[in-house]
C-alpha cells in the first residue's frame, strides 16, 4: 500500500519535494518519477531461495527513526 504525497525536506535539500501518490522521489535526479521506473522493494515469496549473490532488502526487527522503510520521509514508498 503506497503512502499519499509527503513533503520531503532533507538537511541537504533546499526545498520540500512533494510527490503525488503514484510517484516516488528519485534521489539521483532529484525529482519525482513514476514509481514503476524505480526498483521498489518486492516481498520475497515464502520458501523461495534467491540465487546468489542476490540479497533482497528488509528492515531490521528493531528500526530506529529514519533507518527503516516505515520511518522514511520519502514519498510513495511501499
Amino acid at each position: 500500500m503506497r503512502r499519499g504525497p509527503r513533503s520531503l525536506r532533507g538537511r541537504d535539500a533546499p526545498a520540500p519535494t512533494p510527490c503525488v501518490p503514484a510517484e516516488c522521489f528519485d534521489l539521483l535526479v532529484r525529482h519525482c518519477v513514476a514509481c514503476g521506473l524505480l526498483r521498489t522493494p518486492r516481498p520475497k515469496p515464502a520458501g523461495a531461495s534467491s540465487p546468489a549473490p542476490r540479497t533482497a532488502l528488509q528492515p531490521q526487527e528493531s528500526v530506529g527513526a529514519g533507518a527503516g522503510e516505515a520511518a522514511l520521509p520519502l514519498p510513495g514508498l511501499l
Epitope: 520531503l8 525536506r9 532533507g10 538537511r11 541537504d12 535539500a13 516516488c24 522521489f25 528519485d26 534521489l27 539521483l28 535526479v29 518519477v33 514503476g36 521506473l37 524505480l38 526498483r39 521498489t40 522493494p41 542476490r54 540479497t55 533482497a56 532488502l57 531490521q60 528500526v63 530506529g64 527513526a65 529514519g66 533507518a67 527503516g68 522503510e69 520511518a71 522514511l72 520521509p73 520519502l74 514508498l77
Partner: antibody, heavy 117, light 111 residues
Amino acid sequence: VQLQESGPGLVKPSQTLSLTCTVSGDSITSGYWNWIRQHPGKGLEYIGYISYSGSTYYNPSLKSRVTISRDTSKNQFSLKLSSVTAADTAVYYCASPNYPFYAMDYWGQGTLVTVSS
Amino acid sequence: EIVLTQSPATLSLSPGERATLSCRASESVDNYGISFLNWFQQKPGQAPRLLIYAASNRATGIPARFSGSGSGTDFTLTISSLEPEDFAVYYCQQSKEVPWTFGGGTKVEIK
C-alpha cells in the same frame, strides 16, 4: 533476478574493452544499472550507470574513456572502455541498486578482463 | 566525491570473538533523514554481498549477529560473535551521491 556479465577475457593495450550484462527476471527499463570494477587484490571502483530512461552517469575518473549503453529488446546493458592499459585489468561487475536506499543488492558474478599484448 | 576510510585494514580475531569495523566519510552521507551507507561482505572469487543498507538495516537472509550503526560521517559494522564463514573482506559504500564510492575494505582474518 540474475545478472550475467559476458565478453572477452583478454584485451590488447590501446584497444576497447567491451562487456555486456544480461539481466533476467527484471527489466532494465526500471531502476539503475551499474558497472563496478575491482583490480586484483584491491578494492571496488565505481564506473557508472545507465538509468531506466537511458540516461548515463560516468565516474569522472574514467569519463573520457567510458560509454554505457543498453539494448532494451535483449534486456542487456553494455560497457565500453577505450584506450585500455594494463591498469584496466580487473574483475568487472554489473550490479543494480534497490529503491529507496540505492543499495546494490543485485550483482553479477563478475568477469576478469586482462589487458595484455 | 565522498571519500570513505575504513579501519582497521586488517582485523585478526578468533571464532566467537566480537568484530568491530569502522567507516568514516569525508562528509555527511545523511540526506532526507536517511544515512546512505551500506556494508558488503566479499569472499575470494565471489561478488560482494549486501549485508547492511541505510546504516543499520540487515538485508534479507543476513544473520542477526551482523549489525550496523552510525550516522553522518561515522559508521560501525559489528559482528557480535564471529562464525568461521564470517572471515572475509568487508566494504562500506555510500549511496548518497554519485560517484558512489567504496571504502578500502577491512579484512577479517583468523587469528
